[in-house]
């Protein structure tokens, strides 16, 4: 069909044609001119705007020997892979003398099978949990109607009758595939097939069942896992960072977590080899044949204090008259808590045992009753925490002090002369 009128003085003897096709099409638009004298540069316009970076070539053919003879000029604009942005009205423009000439227009249009702007993506979802899938397609030609398919079965009676850009799935109990068909006047395009993998739901109600200094027993309630039974659950424990630790839902902690697997059921696990009196964070995830659930939030827990695991070390006891000097060092064995102090017990062969709470000092001077003639006096020391006493040391006999033997620097503690003893708080 005619497109405008060739201007009387127009040098154009050929105008751009029409290109209509599907995306990716390659085509060429041409302008042909016959001019007298020096040939002009041909510019290309799209929708009236000069194309600065056009992929164009210009060929000039002289029709005579003389400079002033006619020339044929052919400018070719190549469209390498047709896109929506290429569509529009194309014209050639030349400047000849003081005049501007524009060719008749040609049109580039996009028309073909629907083109997907968005396709459903593979994803994992928890069993029985709602989610949405997206699909978007365009022509031209419009309209484009979508038809969703689940496991290759259409979810509507006809294209355009069911959900369009977004498909709401109320929940799945088995791994399924979803795709979408885009229909227009030119035909049908099918999207990629997205696999939606059904994983177990996140476990709930992670809690402590019992606590011991080096062990915690925890339990949880499993989430739904669709048609796939749970194979095991994985529990992670990590040392909290000075009690500041990980807030619920924060990223993974920096330290390598202690990981344990639990056969299920029961949904319970004893976590051993922990540090006493230590804050931890724990979380759990459960796994089916389809993969693991998401982790629960980190739950802060703490092991209780234990009693020291060994007696104080290097106990020495010397006697000088009615005084006895006793000193010792902190147990080498784990304290399993915060050391609150030491208890000391001494006893003669025929006298009752005397118990003392020394506090955190590691030496004591005892004022012995009477003239110091008590025979076979022995001393025992134990460390204690809030959880109780650690083991007592073996009895250390009181040695007689020899001149020249160094005496410990200490604060003299004078014990009451009465044999009565006030038992400590424990």
């Amino acid at each position: 069909a005619p497109r405008g009128t060739q201007a009387e003085e127009s040098p154009f003897v050929g105008n751009p044609g029409n290109i209509t096709g599907a995306r990716g099409l390659t085509g060429t638009l041409r302008c042909q001119l016959q001019v007298q004298g020096e040939p002009p540069e041909v510019h290309w316009l799209r929708d009236g705007q000069i194309l600065e970076l056009a992929d164009s070539t210009q060929t000039q053919v002289p029709l005579g020997e003389d400079e002033q003879d006619d020339w044929i000029v052919v400018s070719q604009l190549r469209i390498t892979s047709l896109q929506l942005s290429d569509t529009g009205q194309y014209q050639c423009l030349v400047f000849l003398g003081h005049q501007t000439f524009v060719s008749q227009p040609g049109y580039v249009g996009l028309e073909g099978l629907p083109y997907f702007l968005e396709e459903p993506e593979d994803r994992t979802v928890a069993a029985n949990t709602p989610f949405n899938l997206s699909c978007q397609a365009q022509g031209p030609p419009e309209p484009v109607d979508l038809l969703w398919l689940q496991d290759a079965v259409p979810l509507a009676t006809a294209p355009g009758h069911g959900p369009q850009r977004s498909l709401h799935v109320p929940g799945l109990n088995k791994t399924s595939s979803f795709s979408c068909e885009a229909h227009n006047a030119k035909g049908v395009t099918t999207s990629r097939t997205a696999t939606i993998t059904v994983l177990p739901q996140q476990p709930r109600n992670l809690h402590l069942v019992s606590r011991q200094p080096t062990e915690l027993e925890v339990a949880w309630t499993p989430g739904l896992s669709g048609i796939y039974p749970l194979t095991h659950c994985t529990l992670q424990a990590v040392l909290s960072d000075d009690g500041m630790g990980i807030q619920a839902g924060e990223p993974d902690p920096p330290e390598e977590p202690l990981t344990s697997q639990a056969s299920v059921p029961p949904h319970q696990l004893r976590l051993g080899s922990l540090h006493p009196h230590t804050p931890y964070h724990i979380r759990v995830a459960c796994t089916s044949s389809q993969g693991p659930s998401s982790w629960t939030h980190w739950l802060p827990v703490e092991t209780p204090e234990g009693v020291p695991l060994g007696p104080p070390e290097n106990i020495s006891a010397t006697r000088n008259g009615s005084q006895a000097f006793v000193h010792w060092q902190e147990p080498r064995a784990p304290l399993q808590g915060t050391l609150l102090g030491y208890r000391l017990a001494y006893q003669g062969q025929d006298t009752p045992e005397v118990l003392m709470d020394i506090g955190l000092r590691q030496e004591v001077t005892l004022e012995l009753q009477g003239d110091g003639s008590v025979s076979n006096l022995t001393v025992c020391v134990a460390a204690y925490t809030a959880a109780g006493d650690g083991p007592w040391s073996l009895p250390v006999p009181l040695e007689a002090w020899r001149p020249g033997q160094a005496q410990p620097v200490h604060q003299l503690v004078k014990e009451p002369s009465t044999p009565a003893f006030s038992w400590p708080w424990w």
């Epitope: 009128t5 060739q6 044609g17 041409r30 029709l63 006619d70």
Partner: antibody
Framework: EVKLVESGGGLVQPGGSLNLSCAAS????????MSWVRQTPEKRLEWVAF????????YYPDTVKGRFTFSRDNARNTLYLQMSSLNSEDTAMYFC?????????????WGQGTSVTVSS | DIVMTQSHKFMSTSVGDRVSITCKAS??????VAWYQQKPGQSPKLLIY???TRHTGVPDRFTGSGSGTDYTLTISSVQAEDLALYFC?????????FGAGTKLELK
């Protein structure tokens, strides 16, 4: 429907003249360049003349230059080819043809032709 | 002037065959080549222009190709109604010139 109808052909003596016409219909005549092409008895095709849509530009091959004149009347949708000094080489079937929009020198529609015989 | 040479005056073919008619220009014509079909008693009909652009209504069994000086018209599966005279033409510049024609006939 594009329609081109030539007329005015006939028998003419060498050195004589003849005027051919071409009546166009079915398209916007003033928007198209037109050409005359002839076909010799040996079936060879020869281009004879070209005229731009407004009639301001005409081109001829050397074989007819100075002897043939191509003109158009856009108001009447008619082309004219005035031929003089005819010789036996001009004996042919003469077709008027419309130039395509994409190249005026390629011809998308042709008339049925009018026969010109130059003979004594 | 640009000379267009169709080396085969005649080409024999059978219905259903693929046939290629060639045309050579005496200089580069920048793909400005048209192909015409003419049946006995009829005027020429445009098939192809700009070497490969199919004219409206032309069956897609007709395809044009080529560049520079060498051009080809291919009929992918010859039909009985395709038996005719085929001309090439350069539409680059005046004087416009045609090939001598190739007659496609039955074997």
């Amino acid at each position: 429907e594009v329609k081109l109808v030539e007329s005015g052909g006939g028998l003419v003596q060498p050195g004589g003249s003849l005027n051919l016409s071409c009546a166009a219909s079915g398209f916007t005549f003033s928007s198209y360049s037109m050409s005359w092409v002839r076909q010799t008895p040996e079936k060879r095709l020869e281009w004879v003349a070209f005229i731009s849509n407004g009639g301001g530009r005409t081109y001829y091959p050397d074989t007819v230059k100075g002897r043939f004149t191509f003109s158009r009347d856009n108001a009447r949708n008619t082309l004219y080819l005035q031929m003089s000094s005819l010789n036996s080489e001009d004996t042919a079937m003469y077709f008027c043809a419309r130039g395509t929009t994409e190249s005026y020198y390629a011809m998308d529609y042709w008339g049925q032709g009018t026969s010109v015989t130059v003979s004594s | 002037d640009i000379v267009m040479t169709q080396s085969h005056k005649f080409m024999s073919t059978s219905v259903g065959d693929r046939v290629s008619i060639t045309c050579k220009a005496s200089q580069d014509v920048i793909t400005a080549v048209a192909w015409y079909q003419q049946k006995p008693g009829q005027s020429p009909k445009l098939l192809i222009y700009w070497a490969s652009t199919r004219h409206t209504g032309v069956p897609d069994r007709f395809t044009g190709s080529g560049s520079g000086t060498d051009y080809t018209l291919t009929i992918s599966s010859v039909q009985a109604e395709d038996l005719a005279l085929y001309f090439c033409q350069q539409h680059l510049s005046t004087p416009l010139t045609f090939g001598a024609g190739t007659k496609l006939e039955l074997k």
